[in-house]
């Protein structure tokens, strides 16, 4: 708390600029009426201040408003947005765009703060869902923010939003988080030929079922190895030599390199030996000639 | 190009006076606060004084108040360090600095002018 | 504010992970900055705000802390690095450094 002293002769402040940069911290306190603070925010962004200093404005601030800043004020706030807490923050009601990039803005360059993240959940609380300015505001601060969310969380995007996510912001997403977001773009690219379709979907596709998987190996989409090296294990597993074939075109010469390492380790494992040698890449490890094999899945299925 | 260049140093009696210069390109002079920052031989930094981008405010470390005059021409682009009542514990570097926008770090610096106070 | 660096001074290598703390006398939240300075040259901002990286910096450096302790990081030390870096407070009034610590060749 700062003590409660008398403004000096003289230094009343009447506006907030940069008459102020000197002051001490009793002299802010005393000098600069909270009021006066709220309606000129956008002033205290051009005065080099303190931290010190910061903290009585936000201390003046805080006694004004003890329920939540306005939103007139917060689009404002600017550098003094860094000295808020999560706490303060869950307090406010942010529902412009322009004040949440404004915000952004100020932390950039910054790793996601928990500051940022308590704005972004407030900020798309109050939207009801992730429509398409907000996700392409919040990948375009931060490309990870998409796979920082739960698989919940992400059901709330609408497939209309999947227009703004690049293939960067999909990098840290695991399973799960694709397993969700696969369908939506699915319906989002519906409309698109075959090869416009596979590029936009490509980065998504570690949500996608093995159906999905055969049909585009019948579209010579030529998928690159680190595409494939990231289906899912048991998308991959049902799909011939043959599908795979097709399906990495020539690409198929990088599975030699990728043998032992999942999901092409497992997928090798249930392929007859013979139909692995068609592809001339000395995989080894199939399923040797004149073995049966049981699908014990598909019989407990039908019992 | 951004450049901040100081001027005026040089060999002064102990009681002496000098003024140093810094003259700024490249940024809207008037919309930074400046500072200088001195460094005795061998030694680490000083934030000596300070003043605000309209030169209505300014501030000095306690070792050189009543001593020492910032001041700034906008107009000319150019910062000043008036130093009088000159000690030989002044001998030093002396920076002139801009200050970034919205706090007290120093994001530029020139290349500084040498002060040697000495009988 | 008084800021203590520490080492004073190091040796180290091409390719060392090199570390440097600041200790501040009472706590500064994350005020604080880091300069580099070559003999004969001006200081050149590298971190501020604690761990910010200032714009055409190189990635291998890096800043931590908040409150009192602070530590700058060099993750793989190159031959230009070899240097005094000075770290300043700018929590409030008088702007103080810290005594430097010179990183020298071993």
């Known amino acids: 708390e700062v003590e409660k002293t008398a403004c000096p002769s003289g230094k009343k402040a009447r506006e907030i600029d940069e008459s102020l940069i000197f002051y001490k911290k009793w002299e802010l306190e005393a000098c600069v009426d909270a009021a006066l603070l709220a309606t000129q925010m956008d002033r205290v962004n051009a005065i080099p201040f303190t931290y010190e200093q910061l903290d009585v404005l936000k201390h003046k601030l805080d006694e004004l408003y003890p329920q939540g800043y306005p939103e007139s004020v917060i689009q404002h706030l600017g550098y003094l947005f860094l000295k808020m807490s999560p706490e303060d923050i869950r307090k406010w009601n942010v529902t412009s765009l322009e004040t949440l990039k404004a915000l952004l803005e100020v932390n950039k360059g910054h790793e996601m703060s928990p500051q940022v993240a308590t704005l972004i959940d407030r900020f798309v609380k109050g939207r009801g869902q992730l429509d398409k300015d907000t996700l392409d505001t919040l990948t375009a601060f931060y490309p990870g923010y998409l796979c920082s969310l739960s698989p919940e969380e992400l059901s709330s995007v609408p497939p209309s939003s999947i227009w703004a996510v690049r293939p960067q912001d999909l990098d840290t997403c695991d399973p799960r988080q694709l397993d969700v977001l696969y369908p939506k773009a699915r319906l989002a690219f519906q409309n698109m030929n075959g090869s416009e379709y596979f590029v936009k979907i490509q980065s998504f596709l570690g949500g996608a079922p093995t159906e999905d998987l055969k049909a585009l190996s019948q579209q010579n989409v030529s998928m690159d190895l680190a595409t494939f090296m990231k289906l899912r294990t048991d998308a991959v597993l049902p799909l011939t030599v043959a599908e795979v074939q097709k399906l990495l075109g020539p690409h198929v010469e990088g599975l030699k390199a990728e043998e032992r390492h999942r999901p092409v380790r497992d997928w090798i494992l249930r392929q007859r030996q013979d139909d692995l040698d068609t592809l001339g890449l000395g995989l080894q490890g199939g399923i040797p000639n004149g073995y049966l094999v049981l699908d014990l899945s598909m019989q407990e299925a039908l019992s | 190009e951004v450049q901040l260049l100081e001027s005026g140093g040089g060999l002064v009696q102990p009681g002496g006076s000098l003024r140093l210069s810094c003259a700024a390109s490249g940024f809207t002079f008037s919309s930074y606060a400046m500072s200088w920052v001195r460094q005795a031989p061998g030694k680490g930094l000083e934030w000596v004084s300070a003043i605000s981008g309209s030169g209505g405010s300014t501030y000095y470390a306690d070792s050189v108040k009543g001593r020492f005059t910032i001041s700034r021409d906008n107009s000319k682009n150019t910062l000043y360090l008036q130093m009088n009542s000159l000690r030989a514990e002044d001998t030093a570097v002396y920076y002139c600095?801009?200050?970034?926008?919205?706090?007290?770090?120093?994001?530029?610096w020139g290349r500084g002018t040498l002060v040697t106070v000495s009988s | 504010i008084q800021l203590t660096q520490s080492p004073s001074s190091l040796s180290a290598s091409v390719g060392d992970r090199v570390t440097i703390t600041c200790r501040a006398s009472?706590?500064?939240?994350?005020?604080l900055a880091w300069y580099q300075q070559k003999p004969g040259k001006a200081p050149k901002l590298l971190i501020y705000?604690?761990?910010s990286l200032e714009s055409g910096v190189p990635s291998r450096f890096s800043g931590s802390g908040s409150g009192t302790d602070f530590t700058l990081t060099i993750s793989s030390l190159q031959p230009e690095d070899f240097a005094t870096y000075y770290c300043q407070q700018f929590n409030n009034y008088p702007l103080t450094f810290g005594g430097g610590t010179k990183v020298e060749i071993k």
């Open positions: 600095a801009k200050v970034d926008r919205t706090t007290w770090y120093f994001d530029l």
């Open positions: 009472q706590g500064i939240s994350s005020a």
């Open positions: 705000d604690a761990s």
